[in-house]
């Protein structure tokens, strides 16, 4: 999916009002310096591409974050503010339901959510100096 035509300001507002708090709740008890930055993004569409990938694609050691509160709110925000996003996700959602396993918060998932926090921060940050 090409995130170029999303309403970035509306997505930013959704992040600031709820998603950020849900991410903090998920990471509670974890030091902010515990994980190094291993993923970045270079513009808002790129950030959303990486956020979608980390949030909804199963990875080794972290089978699924998709049922977490922050993930469901992320999905809702993208569905509302990114034209045509919902249609592209129907098949992926059906496949995910079949794969669903019991919820376990592993260290790998914590690391992945830490990376998500970094991506969201980059998505929201203004470029302080244009240089």
């Amino acid at each position: 999916y090409d995130f170029t035509n999303c309403d970035f300001e509306k997505i930013k507002a959704a992040y600031l009002s709820t998603i950020s708090k849900d991410l903090i709740t998920y990471m509670s008890g974890t030091k902010s310096t515990e994980f190094n930055n291993t993923v970045s993004c270079s513009n808002r569409p790129h950030c959303l591409t990486e956020i979608q990938s980390l949030t909804f694609n199963p990875t080794a050691g972290c089978a699924s974050l998709a049922k977490e509160m922050f993930a469901m709110k992320t999905k809702a925000a993208l569905a509302i503010w990114c034209p045509g996003y919902s249609e592209t996700q129907i098949n992926a959602t059906q496949a995910m339901k079949k794969r669903r396993k019991r919820k376990v918060t592993t260290n790998k998932c914590l690391e992945q959510v830490s990376q998500l926090q970094g991506l969201w921060r980059r998505f929201n940050r203004p470029l302080l100096k244009q240089q």
Epitope: N36, N37, S40, S42, E50, R122, L127, L128, K129, Q131
Partner: antibody, heavy 122, light 108 residues
Framework: QMQLVESGGGVVQPGRSLRLSCAAS????????MHWVRQAPGKGLEWVAV????????HYADSVKGRFTITRDNSKNTLNLQMNSLRAEDTAVYYC???????????????WGQGTMVTVSS | SYVLTQPPSVSVAPGQTARITCGGN??????VHWYQQKPGQAPVLVVY???DRPSWIPERFSGSNSGNTATLTISRGEAGDEADYYC???????????FGGGTKLTVL
């Protein structure tokens, strides 16, 4: 463990070519801008070239423009530097390094390889 | 092209504060990054975006930037701080990374 490992350095005659490679591991390579920086013996750091995270944008130092070519293969997590028409003044340790980028601004060079030595001599 | 000017050398007594400057035309409008390089080793990022510090760098390292001068401050200097220090910016005008000439810090 985030790591950058350079290879391909060696001794080469003036006018000849050499290809440097940099293998990245421990981070999502395709999301970072990648640079080559060199350091001549006893001298300071000199930036050589940068390639954007997607490979769409490339910039070179004036001293190497037209002779060096930077490329990346995101499927293999590798960065390359093709060096043609080498000169004695290209003799240096060549470092591969990464930086986050935002639009067309490259941020701090936060991870560096250990470097590979290139000697141009007849 | 944009030029960054550093003093070739700076000395500090153990336990005292060292300040390394980096001069450039209106450098305050740039994000300045600082690197430490010990002999035979690759550079290491010690301060980024003027004053932020990677998590693995001690709080003794700090930075500031305004006007035509950026400054790296190393408080409570130690023998292990002896190294070359480089400032760096990205110039969007020339689309180049620019390094200062480097400053050799000696802990007396």
């Amino acid at each position: 463990q985030m790591q950058l490992v350079e290879s391909g350095g060696g001794v080469v005659q003036p006018g000849r070519s050499l290809r440097l490679s940099c293998a990245a591991s421990g981070f999502t390579f395709r999301t970072y801008g990648m640079h080559w920086v060199r350091q001549a013996p006893g001298k300071g750091l000199e930036w050589v070239a940068v390639i954007s995270y997607s490979g769409s944008y490339i910039h070179y130092a004036d001293s190497v423009k037209g002779r060096f070519t930077i490329t990346r293969d995101n499927s293999k997590n590798t960065l390359n530097l093709q060096m043609n028409s080498l000169r004695a003044e290209d003799t240096a340790v060549y470092y591969c390094t990464r930086s986050p980028q935002w639009e067309e601004v490259y941020e701090a060079l936060d991870i560096w390889g250990q470097g590979t030595m290139v000697t141009v001599s007849s | 092209s944009y030029v960054l000017t550093q003093p070739p050398s700076v000395s500090v007594a153990p336990g005292q504060t060292a300040r390394i400057t980096c001069g450039g035309n209106n450098i305050g409008s740039f994000s300045v990054h600082w690197y430490q390089q010990k002999p035979g080793q690759a550079p290491v990022l010690v301060v980024y975006d003027d004053s932020d510090r990677p998590s693995w760098i001690p709080e003794r390292f700090s930075g500031s930037n305004s006007g035509n001068t950026a400054t790296l401050t190393i408080s409570r200097g130690e023998a292990g701080d002896e190294a070359d220090y480089y400032c760096q910016v990205w110039s969007s005008t020339s689309r180049h990374v620019v390094f200062g000439g480097g400053t050799k810090l000696t802990v007396l």
